[in-house]
Protein backbone atom coordinates (compact mmCIF):
# COMPACT_ATOMS: atom_id res chain seq x y z
CA UNK A 1 0.00 0.00 0.00
CA UNK A 2 1.21 3.48 -0.63
CA UNK A 3 1.88 4.86 2.80
CA UNK A 4 0.68 8.26 1.68
CA UNK A 5 -2.72 6.87 0.87
CA UNK A 6 -4.54 9.05 3.29
CA UNK A 7 -6.22 8.91 6.63
CA UNK A 8 -6.12 5.22 6.90
CA UNK A 9 -9.52 4.06 5.83
CA UNK A 10 -8.94 4.14 2.13
CA UNK A 11 -6.88 1.88 -0.06
CA UNK A 12 -6.32 3.57 -3.34
CA UNK A 13 -4.53 0.87 -5.18
CA UNK A 14 -5.43 -2.44 -3.76
CA UNK A 15 -6.96 -5.02 -6.02
CA UNK A 16 -9.54 -7.32 -4.61
CA UNK A 17 -10.22 -10.11 -6.89
CA UNK A 18 -11.27 -9.12 -10.25
CA UNK A 19 -14.73 -9.20 -11.47
CA UNK A 20 -16.05 -12.46 -12.14
CA UNK A 21 -15.83 -11.76 -15.69
CA UNK A 22 -12.22 -11.77 -15.35
CA UNK A 23 -12.33 -8.37 -16.61
CA UNK A 24 -9.92 -5.66 -16.45
CA UNK A 25 -12.62 -3.52 -15.17
CA UNK A 26 -11.47 -0.11 -14.45
CA UNK A 27 -11.59 -0.88 -10.86
CA UNK A 28 -11.12 -4.50 -11.10
CA UNK A 29 -8.28 -6.66 -12.25
CA UNK A 30 -6.65 -4.05 -14.30
CA UNK A 31 -3.65 -2.11 -13.63
CA UNK A 32 -3.39 0.15 -16.58
CA UNK A 33 -0.33 1.84 -17.90
CA UNK A 34 0.62 4.91 -19.85
CA UNK A 35 1.76 4.25 -23.34
CA UNK A 36 3.94 7.31 -23.55
CA UNK A 37 6.37 6.23 -20.91
CA UNK A 38 6.50 9.51 -19.05
CA UNK A 39 4.72 8.36 -15.98
CA UNK A 40 5.70 8.14 -12.41
CA UNK A 41 4.39 5.37 -10.26
CA UNK A 42 1.42 6.97 -8.57
CA UNK A 43 0.76 3.98 -6.43
CA UNK A 44 4.04 4.04 -4.69
CA UNK A 45 6.52 1.24 -4.29
CA UNK A 46 4.55 -0.71 -1.72
CA UNK A 47 1.30 -1.21 -3.52
CA UNK A 48 -0.29 -4.61 -3.35
CA UNK A 49 -3.06 -6.38 -5.10
CA UNK A 50 -3.84 -8.01 -8.34
CA UNK A 51 -2.63 -6.01 -11.15
CA UNK A 52 -1.01 -3.82 -8.72
CA UNK A 53 -4.33 -2.30 -7.96
CA UNK A 54 -7.97 -2.61 -7.96
CA UNK A 55 -7.64 0.76 -9.25
CA UNK A 56 -6.45 1.37 -12.67
CA UNK A 57 -3.20 2.56 -11.31
CA UNK A 58 -0.64 3.11 -14.03
CA UNK A 59 2.07 0.50 -13.96
CA UNK A 60 5.70 1.23 -13.51
CA UNK A 61 7.47 1.02 -16.80
CA UNK A 62 5.40 1.88 -19.82
CA UNK A 63 4.57 -0.75 -22.39
CA UNK A 64 6.13 -0.55 -25.80
CA UNK A 65 3.96 0.41 -28.75
CA UNK A 66 3.92 -3.25 -29.85
CA UNK A 67 2.69 -4.35 -26.41
CA UNK A 68 0.04 -1.65 -26.36
CA UNK A 69 -1.18 -2.52 -29.86
CA UNK A 70 -1.24 -6.23 -29.03
CA UNK A 71 -3.30 -5.68 -25.89
CA UNK A 72 -5.66 -3.24 -27.62
CA UNK A 73 -6.15 -5.61 -30.55
CA UNK A 74 -6.93 -8.43 -28.14
CA UNK A 75 -9.51 -6.37 -26.26
CA UNK A 76 -11.03 -4.99 -29.46
CA UNK A 77 -11.56 -8.43 -31.00
CA UNK A 78 -13.07 -9.83 -27.80
CA UNK A 79 -15.29 -6.77 -27.40
CA UNK A 80 -16.60 -6.72 -30.99
CA UNK A 81 -17.19 -10.47 -31.17
CA UNK A 82 -18.75 -10.56 -27.70
CA UNK A 83 -21.11 -7.65 -28.31
CA UNK A 84 -22.11 -8.75 -31.81
CA UNK A 85 -22.68 -12.40 -30.88
CA UNK A 86 -24.62 -11.69 -27.72
CA UNK A 87 -26.78 -8.90 -29.15
CA UNK A 88 -27.58 -11.12 -32.13
CA UNK A 89 -28.68 -13.90 -29.77
CA UNK A 90 -30.88 -11.50 -27.78
CA UNK A 91 -32.43 -10.05 -30.92
CA UNK A 92 -33.22 -13.44 -32.44
CA UNK A 93 -34.75 -14.72 -29.19
CA UNK A 94 -36.95 -11.65 -28.67
CA UNK A 95 -37.91 -11.32 -32.33
CA UNK A 96 -38.55 -14.96 -33.19
CA UNK A 97 -39.20 -16.99 -30.05
CA UNK A 98 -40.75 -14.33 -27.79
CA UNK A 99 -39.02 -15.84 -24.75
CA UNK A 100 -41.56 -18.66 -24.57
CA UNK A 101 -39.38 -21.57 -23.47
CA UNK A 102 -37.27 -22.00 -20.35
CA UNK A 103 -34.18 -22.73 -22.42
CA UNK A 104 -34.51 -19.54 -24.46
CA UNK A 105 -35.04 -17.50 -21.31
CA UNK A 106 -31.77 -18.84 -19.87
CA UNK A 107 -29.95 -18.23 -23.15
CA UNK A 108 -31.30 -14.66 -23.26
CA UNK A 109 -30.16 -13.99 -19.69
CA UNK A 110 -26.73 -15.42 -20.46
CA UNK A 111 -26.42 -13.25 -23.58
CA UNK A 112 -27.53 -10.15 -21.67
CA UNK A 113 -24.97 -10.69 -18.91
CA UNK A 114 -22.21 -11.46 -21.40
CA UNK A 115 -23.04 -8.43 -23.55
CA UNK A 116 -22.98 -6.13 -20.53
CA UNK A 117 -19.69 -7.61 -19.35
CA UNK A 118 -17.98 -7.12 -22.71
CA UNK A 119 -19.44 -3.61 -22.97
CA UNK A 120 -17.01 -2.50 -20.25
CA UNK A 121 -13.98 -3.34 -22.40
CA UNK A 122 -13.89 -0.06 -24.38
CA UNK A 123 -13.69 1.90 -21.10
CA UNK A 124 -10.92 -0.33 -19.86
CA UNK A 125 -9.05 0.02 -23.15
CA UNK A 126 -9.16 3.82 -23.04
CA UNK A 127 -8.03 3.71 -19.41
CA UNK A 128 -5.15 1.46 -20.42
CA UNK A 129 -4.03 3.68 -23.29
CA UNK A 130 -4.34 6.99 -21.46
CA UNK A 131 -3.03 5.83 -18.11
CA UNK A 132 -5.83 7.77 -16.46
CA UNK A 133 -9.59 7.39 -15.96
CA UNK A 134 -11.22 10.18 -18.00
CA UNK A 135 -14.87 9.17 -17.54
CA UNK A 136 -15.67 10.53 -14.09
CA UNK A 137 -16.78 9.05 -10.78
CA UNK A 138 -20.29 7.91 -11.79
CA UNK A 139 -19.04 5.90 -14.77
CA UNK A 140 -16.26 4.50 -12.60
CA UNK A 141 -18.89 3.07 -10.24
CA UNK A 142 -21.07 1.84 -13.08
CA UNK A 143 -18.31 0.13 -15.06
CA UNK A 144 -16.78 -1.65 -12.07
CA UNK A 145 -20.15 -2.84 -10.77
CA UNK A 146 -21.30 -3.98 -14.23
CA UNK A 147 -18.09 -5.93 -14.54
CA UNK A 148 -18.57 -7.79 -11.26
CA UNK A 149 -22.33 -8.09 -11.63
CA UNK A 150 -22.27 -9.64 -15.05
CA UNK A 151 -19.36 -11.91 -14.44
CA UNK A 152 -21.37 -13.46 -11.63
CA UNK A 153 -24.69 -13.42 -13.47
CA UNK A 154 -23.13 -15.08 -16.50
CA UNK A 155 -21.45 -17.77 -14.41
CA UNK A 156 -24.55 -18.38 -12.27
CA UNK A 157 -26.61 -18.76 -15.44
CA UNK A 158 -24.15 -21.36 -16.77
CA UNK A 159 -24.62 -23.24 -13.49
CA UNK A 160 -28.40 -22.91 -13.76
CA UNK A 161 -28.37 -24.35 -17.27
CA UNK A 162 -26.33 -27.35 -16.15
CA UNK A 163 -28.78 -27.95 -13.26
CA UNK A 164 -31.69 -27.54 -15.70
CA UNK A 165 -30.25 -30.22 -18.00
CA UNK A 166 -29.48 -32.50 -15.09
CA UNK A 167 -33.11 -32.28 -13.94
CA UNK A 168 -34.33 -32.91 -17.50
CA UNK A 169 -32.40 -36.18 -17.72
CA UNK A 170 -32.29 -37.47 -14.16
CA UNK A 171 -35.65 -36.21 -12.84
CA UNK A 172 -37.93 -36.05 -15.89
CA UNK A 173 -41.17 -35.87 -13.90
CA UNK A 174 -39.87 -32.97 -11.79
CA UNK A 175 -38.70 -31.40 -15.05
CA UNK A 176 -42.33 -31.02 -16.13
CA UNK A 177 -42.89 -28.53 -13.31
CA UNK A 178 -39.39 -27.07 -13.16
CA UNK A 179 -38.63 -26.39 -16.84
CA UNK A 180 -41.36 -23.81 -17.37
CA UNK A 181 -40.88 -20.25 -18.68
CA UNK A 182 -42.24 -18.82 -15.43
CA UNK A 183 -39.75 -20.74 -13.30
CA UNK A 184 -36.90 -19.83 -15.63
CA UNK A 185 -37.72 -16.14 -15.16
CA UNK A 186 -37.85 -16.56 -11.38
CA UNK A 187 -34.47 -18.36 -11.39
CA UNK A 188 -32.95 -15.60 -13.52
CA UNK A 189 -34.20 -12.93 -11.13
CA UNK A 190 -32.68 -14.92 -8.24
CA UNK A 191 -29.36 -15.06 -10.10
CA UNK A 192 -29.36 -11.27 -10.49
CA UNK A 193 -30.23 -10.82 -6.82
CA UNK A 194 -27.39 -13.18 -5.81
CA UNK A 195 -25.03 -11.23 -8.05
CA UNK A 196 -26.07 -8.07 -6.22
CA UNK A 197 -24.38 -9.47 -3.12
CA UNK A 198 -21.08 -8.54 -4.75
CA UNK A 199 -22.23 -6.04 -7.39
CA UNK A 200 -23.72 -3.50 -4.99
CA UNK A 201 -20.88 -3.39 -2.43
CA UNK A 202 -18.43 -2.97 -5.30
CA UNK A 203 -20.49 -0.07 -6.65
CA UNK A 204 -20.26 1.70 -3.30
CA UNK A 205 -16.55 0.94 -2.94
CA UNK A 206 -15.63 2.18 -6.42
CA UNK A 207 -14.40 5.74 -6.65
CA UNK A 208 -11.99 7.98 -8.54
CA UNK A 209 -8.80 9.18 -6.86
CA UNK A 210 -6.35 11.82 -8.00
CA UNK A 211 -2.82 10.49 -7.85
CA UNK A 212 0.15 12.53 -9.11
CA UNK A 213 -1.39 13.93 -12.24
CA UNK A 214 -3.59 10.98 -13.19
CA UNK A 215 -6.99 9.72 -12.09
CA UNK A 216 -7.51 6.16 -10.89
CA UNK A 217 -10.83 4.38 -10.90
CA UNK A 218 -10.35 2.19 -7.86
CA UNK A 219 -11.98 0.23 -5.07
CA UNK A 220 -11.57 1.67 -1.60
CA UNK A 221 -11.48 -0.58 1.44
CA UNK A 222 -12.09 0.06 5.10
CA UNK A 223 -9.35 -0.84 7.55
CA UNK A 224 -7.84 -3.34 7.75
CA UNK A 225 -7.53 -3.06 3.99
CA UNK A 226 -5.64 -6.35 3.58
CA UNK A 227 -8.56 -8.18 5.21
CA UNK A 228 -11.34 -6.76 2.99
CA UNK A 229 -9.19 -6.97 -0.10
CA UNK A 230 -8.38 -10.64 0.47
CA UNK A 231 -11.94 -11.42 1.49
CA UNK A 232 -13.13 -10.12 -1.88
CA UNK A 233 -10.51 -12.19 -3.69
CA UNK A 234 -11.51 -15.33 -1.79
CA UNK A 235 -15.23 -14.72 -2.41
CA UNK A 236 -14.69 -14.27 -6.13
CA UNK A 237 -12.46 -17.35 -6.32
CA UNK A 238 -14.97 -19.55 -4.49
CA UNK A 239 -18.25 -18.26 -5.94
CA UNK A 240 -17.10 -17.45 -9.47
CA UNK A 241 -14.78 -20.39 -10.01
CA UNK A 242 -14.60 -23.28 -7.53
CA UNK A 243 -18.35 -23.57 -6.92
CA UNK A 244 -19.40 -23.19 -10.59
CA UNK A 245 -16.80 -25.72 -11.75
CA UNK A 246 -18.10 -28.20 -9.16
CA UNK A 247 -21.77 -27.61 -10.03
CA UNK A 248 -21.24 -27.81 -13.79
CA UNK A 249 -19.01 -30.88 -13.60
CA UNK A 250 -21.24 -32.79 -11.16
CA UNK A 251 -24.48 -32.00 -13.02
CA UNK A 252 -23.14 -32.96 -16.43
CA UNK A 253 -21.31 -35.97 -14.98
CA UNK A 254 -24.47 -37.36 -13.36
CA UNK A 255 -26.42 -36.64 -16.52
CA UNK A 256 -24.03 -38.66 -18.68
CA UNK A 257 -23.90 -41.52 -16.15
CA UNK A 258 -27.69 -41.69 -16.23
CA UNK A 259 -27.81 -41.77 -20.03
CA UNK A 260 -25.04 -44.39 -20.15
CA UNK A 261 -26.92 -46.66 -17.76
CA UNK A 262 -30.01 -46.87 -19.98
CA UNK A 263 -30.55 -50.22 -21.67
CA UNK A 264 -32.10 -50.11 -25.13
CA UNK A 265 -34.11 -52.94 -26.68
CA UNK A 266 -33.75 -51.35 -30.09
CA UNK A 267 -31.82 -48.44 -31.57
CA UNK A 268 -28.82 -49.03 -29.31
CA UNK A 269 -26.42 -47.88 -32.03
CA UNK A 270 -28.27 -44.59 -32.20
CA UNK A 271 -28.16 -44.37 -28.42
CA UNK A 272 -24.38 -44.80 -28.49
CA UNK A 273 -24.02 -42.18 -31.20
CA UNK A 274 -26.25 -39.73 -29.34
CA UNK A 275 -24.39 -40.38 -26.13
CA UNK A 276 -21.04 -39.70 -27.80
CA UNK A 277 -22.35 -36.40 -29.15
CA UNK A 278 -23.76 -35.34 -25.79
CA UNK A 279 -20.55 -36.37 -24.00
CA UNK A 280 -18.51 -34.37 -26.51
CA UNK A 281 -20.74 -31.35 -26.01
CA UNK A 282 -20.46 -31.61 -22.22
CA UNK A 283 -16.68 -31.90 -22.38
CA UNK A 284 -16.49 -28.83 -24.63
CA UNK A 285 -18.75 -26.76 -22.34
CA UNK A 286 -16.80 -27.71 -19.20
CA UNK A 287 -13.39 -27.35 -20.89
CA UNK A 288 -14.20 -23.90 -22.31
CA UNK A 289 -15.29 -22.66 -18.88
CA UNK A 290 -12.18 -24.02 -17.17
CA UNK A 291 -9.76 -22.86 -19.89
CA UNK A 292 -11.23 -19.35 -19.93
CA UNK A 293 -11.38 -18.82 -16.19
CA UNK A 294 -8.49 -20.78 -14.65
CA UNK A 295 -5.62 -18.53 -15.83
CA UNK A 296 -6.93 -15.30 -14.33
CA UNK A 297 -7.89 -16.90 -11.01
CA UNK A 298 -4.50 -18.60 -10.70
CA UNK A 299 -2.78 -15.35 -11.67
CA UNK A 300 -4.72 -13.38 -9.04
CA UNK A 301 -3.80 -15.88 -6.33
CA UNK A 302 -0.13 -15.87 -7.32
CA UNK A 303 -0.04 -12.06 -7.39
CA UNK A 304 -1.67 -11.97 -3.96
CA UNK A 305 0.96 -14.29 -2.53
CA UNK A 306 4.17 -13.11 -4.18
CA UNK A 307 5.53 -10.00 -5.82
CA UNK A 308 5.89 -10.41 -9.56
CA UNK A 309 8.34 -8.05 -11.29
CA UNK A 310 6.57 -5.89 -13.86
CA UNK A 311 8.04 -6.91 -17.18
CA UNK A 312 6.56 -6.69 -20.66
CA UNK A 313 5.81 -10.41 -20.52
CA UNK A 314 4.03 -10.00 -17.19
CA UNK A 315 1.91 -7.15 -18.56
CA UNK A 316 0.94 -8.98 -21.73
CA UNK A 317 0.23 -12.27 -19.94
CA UNK A 318 -1.89 -10.44 -17.37
CA UNK A 319 -4.01 -8.78 -20.05
CA UNK A 320 -4.17 -12.03 -21.99
CA UNK A 321 -5.61 -13.79 -18.92
CA UNK A 322 -8.17 -11.01 -18.53
CA UNK A 323 -9.10 -11.25 -22.21
CA UNK A 324 -9.51 -15.02 -21.82
CA UNK A 325 -12.12 -14.45 -19.13
CA UNK A 326 -14.04 -12.19 -21.50
CA UNK A 327 -13.58 -14.76 -24.26
CA UNK A 328 -15.91 -17.02 -22.29
CA UNK A 329 -18.58 -14.36 -22.88
CA UNK A 330 -17.86 -14.54 -26.62
CA UNK A 331 -18.02 -18.33 -26.75
CA UNK A 332 -21.23 -18.69 -24.74
CA UNK A 333 -23.47 -17.62 -27.66
CA UNK A 334 -21.81 -20.27 -29.82
CA UNK A 335 -21.95 -23.03 -27.21
CA UNK A 336 -25.44 -22.38 -25.91
CA UNK A 337 -27.35 -20.63 -28.70
CA UNK A 338 -25.95 -21.33 -32.14
CA UNK A 339 -25.59 -25.03 -31.35
CA UNK A 340 -29.15 -25.26 -30.02
CA UNK A 341 -31.53 -26.66 -32.61
CA UNK A 342 -34.45 -24.42 -31.66
CA UNK A 343 -32.30 -21.31 -31.74
CA UNK A 344 -30.75 -22.34 -35.07
CA UNK A 345 -34.20 -22.62 -36.59
CA UNK A 346 -35.00 -19.07 -35.47
CA UNK A 347 -31.61 -17.87 -36.66
CA UNK A 348 -32.26 -19.31 -40.13
CA UNK A 349 -35.55 -17.41 -40.11
CA UNK A 350 -33.61 -14.26 -39.22
CA UNK A 351 -31.07 -14.82 -42.04
CA UNK A 352 -33.59 -15.95 -44.65
CA UNK A 353 -36.94 -14.42 -43.68
CA UNK A 354 -38.67 -16.20 -46.57
CA UNK A 355 -37.86 -19.66 -45.22
CA UNK A 356 -41.15 -20.01 -43.37
CA UNK A 357 -43.06 -19.26 -46.55
CA UNK A 358 -41.06 -21.88 -48.42
CA UNK A 359 -41.68 -24.36 -45.61
CA UNK A 360 -45.41 -23.70 -45.78
CA UNK A 361 -45.37 -24.26 -49.54
CA UNK A 362 -43.38 -27.46 -49.05
CA UNK A 363 -45.77 -28.81 -46.45
CA UNK A 364 -48.74 -28.00 -48.69
CA UNK A 365 -47.02 -29.84 -51.54
CA UNK A 366 -46.27 -32.78 -49.26
CA UNK A 367 -49.88 -33.01 -48.11
CA UNK A 368 -50.90 -33.06 -51.78
CA UNK A 369 -48.33 -35.80 -52.50
CA UNK A 370 -49.58 -37.81 -49.56
CA UNK A 371 -53.10 -37.85 -50.88
CA UNK A 372 -51.91 -38.91 -54.32
CA UNK A 373 -48.99 -41.17 -53.37
CA UNK A 374 -49.21 -42.13 -49.70
CA UNK A 375 -46.16 -44.37 -49.85
CA UNK A 376 -43.82 -41.55 -50.91
CA UNK A 377 -44.83 -39.05 -48.25
CA UNK A 378 -42.07 -39.90 -45.81
CA UNK A 379 -39.36 -39.80 -48.45
CA UNK A 380 -40.41 -36.48 -49.90
CA UNK A 381 -40.61 -34.70 -46.60
CA UNK A 382 -37.54 -36.33 -45.15
CA UNK A 383 -35.50 -34.83 -47.95
CA UNK A 384 -36.78 -31.38 -47.06
CA UNK A 385 -35.94 -31.79 -43.41
CA UNK A 386 -32.70 -33.71 -43.78
CA UNK A 387 -30.28 -30.92 -42.88
CA UNK A 388 -32.37 -29.72 -39.98
CA UNK A 389 -32.79 -33.19 -38.60
CA UNK A 390 -29.17 -34.27 -38.79
CA UNK A 391 -28.26 -31.39 -36.50
CA UNK A 392 -30.79 -32.10 -33.82
CA UNK A 393 -29.04 -34.42 -31.39
CA UNK A 394 -25.74 -32.74 -32.10
CA UNK A 395 -26.84 -29.57 -30.39
CA UNK A 396 -25.21 -28.92 -27.09
CA UNK A 397 -27.96 -29.02 -24.70
CA UNK A 398 -30.07 -25.92 -24.89
Amino acid sequence: MDSSAGPGNISDCSDPLAPASCSPAPGSWLNLSHVDGNQSDPCGPNRTGLGGSHSLCPQTGSPSMVTAITIMALYSIVCVVGLFGNFLVMYVIVRYTKMKTATNIYIFNLALADALATSTLPFQSVNYLMGTWPFGNILCKIVISIDYYNMFTSIFTLCTMSVDRYIAVCHPVKALDFRTPRNAKIVNVCNWILSSAIGLPVMFMATTKYRQGSIDCTLTFSHPTWYWENLLKICVFIFAFIMPVLIITVCYGLMILRLKSVRMLSGSKEKDRNLRRITRMVLVVVAVFIVCWTPIHIYVIIKALITIPETTFQTVSWHFCIALGYTNSCLNPVLYAFLDENFKRCFREFCIPTSSTIEQQNSARIRQNTREHPSTANTVDRTNHQLENLEAETAPLP
Epitope: V169, A175, K271, I366, A392, A395
Partner: nanobody, 122 residues
Framework: QVQLVESGGGLVRPGGSLRLSCVDS??????MGWFRRAPGKEREFVAS????????TYADSVADRFTTSRDVANNTLYLQMNSLKHEDTAVYYC?????????????????WGQGTQVTVSS
Protein backbone atom coordinates in the same frame (compact mmCIF):
# COMPACT_ATOMS: atom_id res chain seq x y z
CA GLN B 1 -42.22 -53.20 -33.94
CA VAL B 2 -42.31 -50.06 -31.81
CA GLN B 3 -45.53 -49.74 -29.82
CA LEU B 4 -46.55 -46.45 -28.26
CA VAL B 5 -49.34 -46.31 -25.71
CA GLU B 6 -50.72 -42.95 -24.53
CA SER B 7 -52.67 -42.33 -21.34
CA GLY B 8 -53.81 -39.46 -19.13
CA GLY B 9 -56.44 -37.82 -21.34
CA GLY B 10 -59.82 -36.73 -20.04
CA LEU B 11 -62.24 -33.90 -19.44
CA VAL B 12 -60.88 -30.74 -17.82
CA ARG B 13 -62.13 -27.19 -17.22
CA PRO B 14 -60.53 -24.18 -18.96
CA GLY B 15 -57.46 -23.09 -17.01
CA GLY B 16 -56.99 -26.60 -15.66
CA SER B 17 -54.05 -28.99 -16.04
CA LEU B 18 -53.53 -32.47 -17.40
CA ARG B 19 -50.50 -34.75 -17.74
CA LEU B 20 -50.27 -37.17 -20.64
CA SER B 21 -47.90 -40.16 -20.66
CA CYS B 22 -46.66 -42.30 -23.52
CA VAL B 23 -44.89 -45.61 -22.91
CA ASP B 24 -42.48 -46.89 -25.56
CA SER B 25 -42.51 -50.69 -25.39
CA UNK B 26 -39.31 -51.06 -27.38
CA UNK B 27 -37.11 -48.71 -25.33
CA UNK B 28 -35.95 -47.00 -28.51
CA UNK B 29 -33.44 -44.19 -28.68
CA UNK B 30 -35.56 -42.40 -31.26
CA UNK B 31 -36.60 -38.76 -31.07
CA MET B 32 -40.25 -38.49 -30.07
CA GLY B 33 -43.04 -35.97 -30.36
CA TRP B 34 -46.60 -35.04 -29.46
CA PHE B 35 -49.20 -34.15 -32.07
CA ARG B 36 -52.90 -33.41 -31.84
CA ARG B 37 -55.88 -33.52 -34.14
CA ALA B 38 -58.86 -31.32 -33.36
CA PRO B 39 -62.25 -32.22 -34.93
CA GLY B 40 -62.27 -31.26 -38.61
CA LYS B 41 -58.64 -30.10 -38.58
CA GLU B 42 -55.23 -31.33 -39.78
CA ARG B 43 -52.89 -33.13 -37.43
CA GLU B 44 -50.90 -30.41 -35.64
CA PHE B 45 -47.44 -30.48 -34.07
CA VAL B 46 -47.38 -29.85 -30.30
CA ALA B 47 -43.88 -30.71 -29.03
CA SER B 48 -40.87 -32.89 -29.73
CA UNK B 49 -37.85 -34.01 -27.74
CA UNK B 50 -34.50 -35.66 -28.37
CA UNK B 51 -33.61 -39.08 -27.02
CA UNK B 52 -31.69 -37.57 -24.10
CA UNK B 53 -34.70 -35.52 -23.01
CA UNK B 54 -32.60 -32.38 -22.84
CA UNK B 55 -33.71 -30.48 -25.88
CA UNK B 56 -37.50 -29.96 -26.21
CA THR B 57 -39.15 -28.02 -29.03
CA TYR B 58 -42.66 -26.57 -28.86
CA ALA B 59 -45.29 -25.17 -31.19
CA ASP B 60 -45.70 -21.41 -30.65
CA SER B 61 -49.29 -21.85 -29.54
CA VAL B 62 -48.35 -24.01 -26.54
CA ALA B 63 -44.76 -23.02 -25.70
CA ASP B 64 -45.60 -21.03 -22.59
CA ARG B 65 -48.19 -23.54 -21.27
CA PHE B 66 -46.99 -27.05 -22.13
CA THR B 67 -43.84 -28.87 -20.99
CA THR B 68 -42.55 -32.16 -22.34
CA SER B 69 -39.94 -34.45 -20.80
CA ARG B 70 -38.61 -37.92 -21.37
CA ASP B 71 -37.72 -40.57 -18.81
CA VAL B 72 -35.01 -42.54 -20.61
CA ALA B 73 -34.79 -45.11 -17.82
CA ASN B 74 -38.51 -45.93 -17.84
CA ASN B 75 -38.99 -45.32 -21.58
CA THR B 76 -41.82 -42.86 -20.96
CA LEU B 77 -42.61 -39.56 -22.66
CA TYR B 78 -44.64 -36.94 -20.76
CA LEU B 79 -46.63 -33.89 -21.74
CA GLN B 80 -47.65 -31.53 -18.94
CA MET B 81 -50.46 -29.23 -20.12
CA ASN B 82 -51.25 -26.18 -17.98
CA SER B 83 -53.71 -23.29 -18.46
CA LEU B 84 -55.75 -25.36 -20.90
CA LYS B 85 -58.05 -23.56 -23.34
CA HIS B 86 -61.08 -24.67 -25.33
CA GLU B 87 -58.94 -24.77 -28.46
CA ASP B 88 -56.69 -27.42 -26.88
CA THR B 89 -59.52 -29.94 -27.23
CA ALA B 90 -58.21 -32.71 -29.51
CA VAL B 91 -56.99 -36.28 -29.72
CA TYR B 92 -53.33 -36.22 -28.63
CA TYR B 93 -50.89 -38.61 -30.29
CA CYS B 94 -47.43 -39.71 -29.26
CA UNK B 95 -45.04 -40.43 -32.15
CA UNK B 96 -41.49 -41.70 -32.67
CA UNK B 97 -39.26 -41.41 -35.67
CA UNK B 98 -36.13 -42.85 -37.20
CA UNK B 99 -33.11 -41.38 -35.42
CA UNK B 100 -32.21 -38.33 -37.46
CA UNK B 101 -33.28 -35.64 -35.02
CA UNK B 102 -36.43 -33.78 -34.09
CA UNK B 103 -39.03 -32.63 -36.57
CA UNK B 104 -42.32 -30.79 -36.43
CA UNK B 105 -43.65 -32.55 -39.52
CA UNK B 106 -45.95 -35.53 -38.90
CA UNK B 107 -44.68 -37.07 -42.14
CA UNK B 108 -41.29 -37.55 -40.54
CA UNK B 109 -42.66 -39.83 -37.83
CA UNK B 110 -42.72 -43.58 -38.44
CA UNK B 111 -44.51 -44.87 -35.33
CA TRP B 112 -47.72 -43.60 -33.77
CA GLY B 113 -49.79 -44.31 -30.69
CA GLN B 114 -53.54 -44.76 -30.83
CA GLY B 115 -54.19 -41.34 -29.28
CA THR B 116 -55.85 -40.11 -26.11
CA GLN B 117 -58.79 -37.68 -26.03
CA VAL B 118 -58.39 -34.36 -24.23
CA THR B 119 -61.57 -32.28 -23.85
CA VAL B 120 -61.47 -28.77 -22.40
CA SER B 121 -64.97 -27.69 -21.51
CA SER B 122 -66.73 -25.74 -18.79
Amino acid sequence: QVQLVESGGGLVRPGGSLRLSCVDSERTSYPMGWFRRAPGKEREFVASITWSGIDPTYADSVADRFTTSRDVANNTLYLQMNSLKHEDTAVYYCAARAPVGQSSSPYDYDYWGQGTQVTVSS
